[in-house]
């Protein structure tokens, strides 16, 4: 898989592959994987990809199911890169406050908050 | 501050306090704090709260600015609680796949993806 494929296209293709291979993936009836209990997905990327690792180790590889796991691995790589960019730029306090304000604003309007 | 205050109300109040105390907070001209370079805030909560800690240690405390940092500490506590819930429930593969599909769907439609 060329890593040059845009991440957005990669995500779309992975969604399709996930749908295609669902029957194969759920064949293991006894396997249990941690599932986050809320929808703030970005907070749980580590656990999601640990779960993917568990699933991959229990799935017979070959054909396009292999491509599915390769895609998921590239998505993980992208997210790891994004995480690295969390602390790269050192800025003046006013810029940090603008980012913090935006973060809280998004939390206020978009997060699923259960008290 | 009662921890029973709903998190959504806490976030709203914190946004207001942030605006009120901006001039005091930016007074340190030479301080530099890491600022994430993308809008996927949830990936960067650790760095954001490290930055808040740096800012708090450089800010003269007292009055409602103290309340601002207490609020931010409660918001951190809430997020830490959410992170704990990422791996608490072990579920069958089909439920994990549903969550993974939703995660990729959200990534596809809502994330700011730069290739």
């Amino acid at each position: 898989i060329p890593t040059e494929i845009p991440t957005s296209a990669l995500v779309k293709e992975t969604l399709a592959l996930l749908s295609t291979h669902r029957t194969l993936l759920i064949a293991n009836e006894t396997l249990r994987i941690p599932v986050p209990v809320h929808k703030n997905h970005q907070l749980c990327t580590e656990e999601i990809f640990q779960g993917i690792g568990t699933l991959e180790s229990q799935t017979v590889q070959g054909g396009t199911v292999e491509r599915l796991f390769k895609n998921l691995s590239l998505i993980k790589k992208y997210i790891d890169g994004q995480k690295k960019k969390c602390g790269e730029e050192r800025r003046r306090v006013n810029q940090f406050l603008d980012y913090l304000q935006e973060f809280l604003g998004v939390m206020n309007t978009e997060w699923i908050i259960e008290s | 501050i009662p921890t029973e205050i709903p998190t959504s109300a806490l976030v709203k109040e914190t946004l207001a306090l942030l605006s009120t105390h901006r001039t005091l907070l930016i007074a340190n001209e030479t301080l530099r704090i890491p600022v994430p370079v993308h809008k996927n805030h949830q990936l960067c909560t650790e760095e954001i709260f490290q930055g808040i800690g740096t800012l708090e240690s450089q800010t003269v405390q007292g009055g409602t600015v103290e309340r601002l940092f207490k609020n931010l500490s409660l918001i951190k506590k809430y997020i830490d609680g959410q992170k704990k819930k990422c791996g608490e429930e072990r579920r069958r593969v089909n439920q994990f796949l549903d969550y993974l599909q939703e995660f990729l769907g959200v990534m596809n439609t809502e994330w700011i993806i730069e290739s």
């Epitope: 730029e89 800025r91 603008d98 | 930016i26 001209e29 030479t30 809008k39």
Partner: antibody
Framework: QVQLQESGPGLVKPSQTLSLTCTVS??????????WSWIRQHPGKGLEWIGY???????YYNPSLKSRVTISVDTSKNQFSLKLSSVTAADTAVYYC?????????WGQGTLVTVSS | SYVLTQPPSVSVAPGQTARITCGGN??????VYWYQQKPGQAPVLVVH???DRPSGIPERFSGSNSGNTATLTISRVEVGDEADYSC???????????FGGGTKLTVLG
Amino acid sequence: QVQLQESGPGLVKPSQTLSLTCTVSGGSISNGGQYWSWIRQHPGKGLEWIGYIYYSGSTYYNPSLKSRVTISVDTSKNQFSLKLSSVTAADTAVYYCASLGNWFDYWGQGTLVTVSS
Amino acid sequence: SYVLTQPPSVSVAPGQTARITCGGNNIGSKNVYWYQQKPGQAPVLVVHDDSDRPSGIPERFSGSNSGNTATLTISRVEVGDEADYSCQVWDSSSDHVVFGGGTKLTVLG
């Protein structure tokens, strides 16, 4: 390497609104570590800061121009814009867009706007 | 609002040292940035945070800042250094950017 390019009319009539757009390439306007700024330079004079905007839409303006200036951002097009209303001959200048981290790190090449009837 | 004052012009012979000042109330407590601008071109940063040089800027360019004056020093001046030089600070009381009026450096001869 981030590049900025100003675009807009080079001639504006007095009392009208000057409108310029800056297109950012080689980087995202949603970069949390950058502000996006407009600066102008009257012929033979020094640099004058007009204002800047954060990707979230927070704006900061030069007090001497605040009543006439609007800066906006379009993250989907990776662009930000300047509008300066009620222009006079005194607004004739080279207008620069620039990215602003801790300092002005990348600049457009500048565009001369003349206010004349 | 905060004001920065620069001399309109400074002249120096090649090989000599040029000093361009930027005055402001208690400027020593702020970070100062210096830009070089040649005719028909956009400004280029030559010194940031009082005395740090970006990559690609010769060591001949240096800066200092204390009290009410920041100084850009160009040693062993070359003809190619002839340009306008502007200082810049942030006014943290308002989150505003402030530029000095600019100084024209003329290299004699």
